[in-house]
Each structure stands twice: as C-alpha cells, then as structure tokens.
C-alpha cells in the first residue's frame, strides 16, 4: 500500500484546514492508527492528534477543541483530520504516521500554508496646493502573508514608489503616490488596489483628491459702457473666480466708501438707479484658505444730456 496526501495545503486565516492522509492499501489491509504530529525543522515532533481504530480520536492538549475528524461517512483507511480556525502559527510541516496490519508503518509529510489576507489602509498626504512641486498625494499600506501587491488605479498623472518590511510571519508593503498638484486633479479619484492570494477579489480604497487653488479674478458687467448711464436700473457687477476651497467675495470702492444703496450679494454688486456718484473704482477681493486675488474696474456713469450736447457741438463744429 501507499499513503496519499498533499505536498502543500493552503488555507486562509480563520478557515478550517483539511490535512489529508489516506492509506491506499491492498484488500484485507487495515489501519490500526494514524498519528499526526507537527514536525518543523529543528524541533521535536509535537503531537497534534491520534486516530485509533478502536479508541477513536485523541487530541493533544495544545490543540484541544481544534482538531476533528472529517464528518461521516468515514473510510477506515482515511486518516485525514480537520484543523479548525487556522492561525498563522499553524503554518509549518506536518507528518502523518500510519500503522497498518499487516503491511507495517508508513509516513508522509505535508506543508500547511496559512494565507493572511491584508487589511489595507490609505493615508492621504499633506494638503495639496497648486504650484507645489512633486508632492505625496497618498500612501497605502497592506500587511499579509505572503506579501500583498499594492498598486494604484487613477487617471491622474503621477509617480509611485513602494517599500516592503518583512516580519516573522508576514510582510507589510507600503506604496506612495506622488504628483504635481494642479486644479484639473480636483475631485479626481485615486484608488489603492491590493491583490493577495487570500482575497477572492482585489481590495480597493478610493481617495478623492482635493487640490487647493484660486483662479485669477475678473469682473463682468462693464462690457458695454454705454449701458452705464444716469437712471439705468438693474446695473450690476459680477466678480468671476473659482477655487478650492470655494472662495468668498468682498467688494470695496478704492476712492471711497461704497455709495448708499449699493447691495453686496456675494460675488455680485447691485446698483440702485445709476447716478454720477456711482462713478469710481470698484475692487473685487476674492479669497480662500489658500490665497487671495483682487480685480478692479472703473465705472464711469454717463450723463446722456452731456453726451447729446457734445454731439450737437461736434455736428455744429463740422
């Protein structure tokens, strides 16, 4: 007869490991007992369990409650055992020693490999600001056994660097993603992808990029100066900018206080019916935590009567 087993049994942390040991005997041969031991190099054999044809299953105190026979029906020639709730410390070499009648004793070894799936973590780097050079956007760390693979999935242009730390029974892998921040990256996803044989599918952690910036400010509303004449209603100036975080707006008049009746509504400056006293230099001040910008415009409120008089003069002059 001969023993049938596996060279390697692979199990995920917390799962049950079946350690196979089947005696393929000739007719009439019987298995008296199967002794399972852990036999790591440099250490003596440590009893795991003894399966006896008459006495049944004996489990070593060190494995009490963790070793069982596979559920029925059982073949009397099958010396396999189940190791419940495999932990990393169970990884190693195991030996089954089968005593048969009349053929004698047989033994076989297998290696138990316990996969420890990683629990990845993503840590954002320092605040990203437009104008910075190459900056850490995020780092992703995953520890497992064997060492996990850590990659990045993103549309954003950047560079990656990885480092690995080996521990006694596992390895930690850290990957960093660096980029040159620009406003176009704002709101873009940066995804850490962790692969490992103990995972049914890759684990993904997504970080949304936030790049602080503030665009140049400009003022809209003076495109047609002829509209800015005495008596006009509904005149307004709008300050244009964008930023992250969203900016706040403030309006001032460079050559004095804002005229009475002028309303400030965020980025918009609303005028009452125009008079000449609304003429002046207006400043839009845009700011966020990252920066501030100013844009100024000159408002010149026209008097239609003056204009028509001049026209008459010009005509008469011709």
């Amino acid at each position: 007869g001969e023993l049938e087993t596996s060279d390697v049994v692979t199990v995920v942390l917390g799962q049950d490991a079946k350690l196979p040991c089947f005696y393929r005997g000739d007719s009439g041969e019987q298995v008296g007992q199967v002794a399972w031991a852990r036999v790591d190099a440099g250490e003596g054999a440590q009893e795991l369990a003894l399966l006896h044809s008459k006495y049944g299953l004996h489990v070593s105190p060190a494995y009490e409650g963790r070793v069982e026979q596979p559920p029925p029906p059982r073949n009397p020639l099958d010396g396999s055992v189940l190791l419940r709730n495999a932990v990393q410390a169970d990884e190693g070499e195991y030996e089954c020693r089968v005593s048969t009648f009349p053929a004698g004793s047989f033994q076989a070894r297998l290696r138990l490999r316990v996969l420890v799936p990683p629990l990845p973590s993503l840590n954002p780097g320092p605040a990203l600001e437009e104008g910075q050079g190459l900056t850490l956007a995020a780092s992703c760390t995953a520890e497992g056994s064997p060492a996990p693979s850590v990659t990045w999935d993103t549309e954003v242009k950047g560079t990656t660097s990885s480092r690995s730390f080996k521990h006694s029974r596992s390895a930690a892998v850290t990957s960093e993603f660096h980029l040159v921040p620009s406003r176009s990256m704002n709101g873009q996803p940066l995804t850490c992808v962790v692969s490992h044989p103990g995972l049914l599918q890759d684990q993904r952690i997504t970080h949304i990029l936030h790049v602080s910036f503030l665009a140049e400010a400009s003022v809209r509303g003076l495109e047609d100066q002829n509209l800015w004449h005495i008596g006009r209603e509904g005149a307004m100036l709008k300050c244009l900018s964008e930023g992250q975080p969203p900016p706040s707006y403030n309006w001032t008049r460079l050559d004095g206080p804002l005229p009475s009746g002028v309303r400030v509504d965020g980025d918009t400056l609303g005028f009452p019916p125009l008079t000449t006293e609304h003429s002046g230099i207006y400043v839009c001040h845009v700011s966020n935590e990252f920066s501030s910008r100013d844009s100024q415009v000159t408002v010149d409120v026209l008097d239609p009567q003056e204009d028509s008089g001049k026209q008459v003069d010009l005509v008469s002059a011709s």
């Epitope: 007992q33 009893e47 008459k54 006495y55 004996h58």
Partner: antibody
Framework: EVQLVESGGGLVQPGGSLRLSCAAS????????MSWVRQAPGKGLEWVSA????????YYADSVKGRFTISRDNSKNTLYLQMNSLRAEDTAVYYC????????????????WGQGTLVTVSS | DIQMTQSPSSLSASVGDRVTITCRAS??????LAWYQQKPGKAPKLLIY???SLQSGVPSRFSGSGSGTDFTLTISSLQPEDFATYYC?????????FGQGTKVEIK
C-alpha cells in the same frame, strides 16, 4: 504468561520512606509503560504514577508529586516506586500495572495488574 | 483533571438479571475508557477497553458502549461470579482517573 509481582510494602511511620518493587515476566518489559495505582482500605482506585517504556517520561498524581519517584530497570525487568515523606493518607494497597504506548503520551488501558502490596503509614 | 462519575454506587440484583452501569466523563474522552472488575482482596481485572472492545478471555455477557462523555457497561445475564465492584477509567489524559465504583451485590 504475563506476571507482575509487587513487594516492599509494610508498616512505616509518618515522614518515613519505603521503596516498592514490581517484578515483571512473560512479556518484553521495555516495550510497555508501567503504572502504580493504589487503593486505600474500603476505597476506590487512585492512579499514582506512570513511566514510559524507556523510562524517559514520568508522570505523577498531584497528591504524590515531589514525594514519590517512579523508575525502572529494564535490564532487571523491574519497576520501582520510591516513597518519601509518607503520610497517613498514603496508606493503601499499591498495584503495578502495564499499558501499551499508542503514540506520543497516549497509552492503552492497563491490561495486567499485580496482586498488590500493602503500605501502612502509622505511628 | 477529568472527573468520572459512576452510577449507581451500588445495586442489588439476582442471577440472570440484566445489569447496566453508567459512567459519565466531565469532558469528551472519545473511546479512551476501560471497565474493570474487582473482587475483595484481588487486583482489578480488565473487562472492556476502548469503551466497547471485549478483553480476551472475558465472557461475552459483558459489553460496553458509548463514546465522548457517556458510557455504559452491561452484563446481559448476571452470573454468581459477577458479584463484585466495577470501575470505569479514562486514559485520554494524564492523570488517568477512575469512577468511584459500583458494587453489585446479591439480592
């Protein structure tokens, strides 16, 4: 025929010592683990100590640990129990018995027993 | 240590009676259980090993059953020579421990 014959029992004062012997015949002595089991007068059976076939492993009940020593001489087919610091509660018939090693520290039931030797601890 | 609880502690029966003695272990011991018979002034004698295997030379009226924690010794038809004290013993762990015994007396 398997035979186990105990000797060495007798009357001893509390605090005294005694050495019991068990002569074995009719089987390959070194292939079997051996045990001492005692029975106080009118009481049940109490396991005392055991030793592996080679003598490399010894086991003791908590009640005798540090006072009793089990040993064997495979060349003489003899099992011993050295009993020191004897107490009144050690009074009992002491039996030797044999058992087979299955594997590791797992043994069969004791299939053969000696006739016993009486140890009386009294002042 | 594993505690072995035997019941009853004594019983009276007549020749020809069917006698059942039970033994309970405080934890699972698979079939690492033996039954012994002891007569006054004599050494214990192994009747049953591995919970249900009959020791060579023991009459077939003796039988054992059970595994795990609950075990039974049955004498199918009590004979005059069977009046004795019966002990169960576990040898799953060290120290091996005995039940307190069951004395079978003549009714």
């Amino acid at each position: 025929e398997v035979q186990l014959v105990e000797s060495g029992g007798g009357l001893v004062q509390p605090g005294g010592s005694l050495r019991l012997s068990c002569a074995a015949s009719g089987f390959t002595f070194s292939s079997y683990a051996m045990s001492w089991v005692r029975q106080a007068p009118g009481k049940g059976l109490e396991w005392v100590s055991a030793i592996s076939g080679s003598g490399g492993s010894t086991y003791y009940a908590d009640s005798v640990k540090g006072r009793f020593t089990i040993s064997r001489d495979n060349s003489k087919n003899t099992l011993y129990l050295q009993m020191n610091s004897l107490r009144a509660e050690d009074t009992a018939v002491y039996y030797c018995a044999r058992a087979e090693l299955l594997a590791f520290d797992v043994y069969t039931a004791s299939d053969y027993w000696g006739q016993g030797t009486l140890v009386t601890v009294s002042s | 240590d594993i505690q072995m609880t035997q019941s009853p502690s004594s019983l009276s029966a007549s020749v020809g009676d069917r006698v059942t003695i039970t033994c309970r272990a405080s934890q699972g011991i698979s079939s690492y259980l033996a039954w012994y018979q002891q007569k006054p002034g004599k050494a214990p004698k192994l009747l049953i090993y591995a919970a249900s295997s009959l020791q060579s030379g023991v009459p077939s009226r003796f039988s054992g059953s059970g595994s795990g924690t609950d075990f039974t010794l049955t004498i199918s038809s009590l004979q005059p020579e069977d009046f004795a004290t019966y002990y169960c013993q576990q040898h799953y762990t060290t120290p091996p421990t005995f039940g307190q015994g069951t004395k079978v007396e003549i009714k």
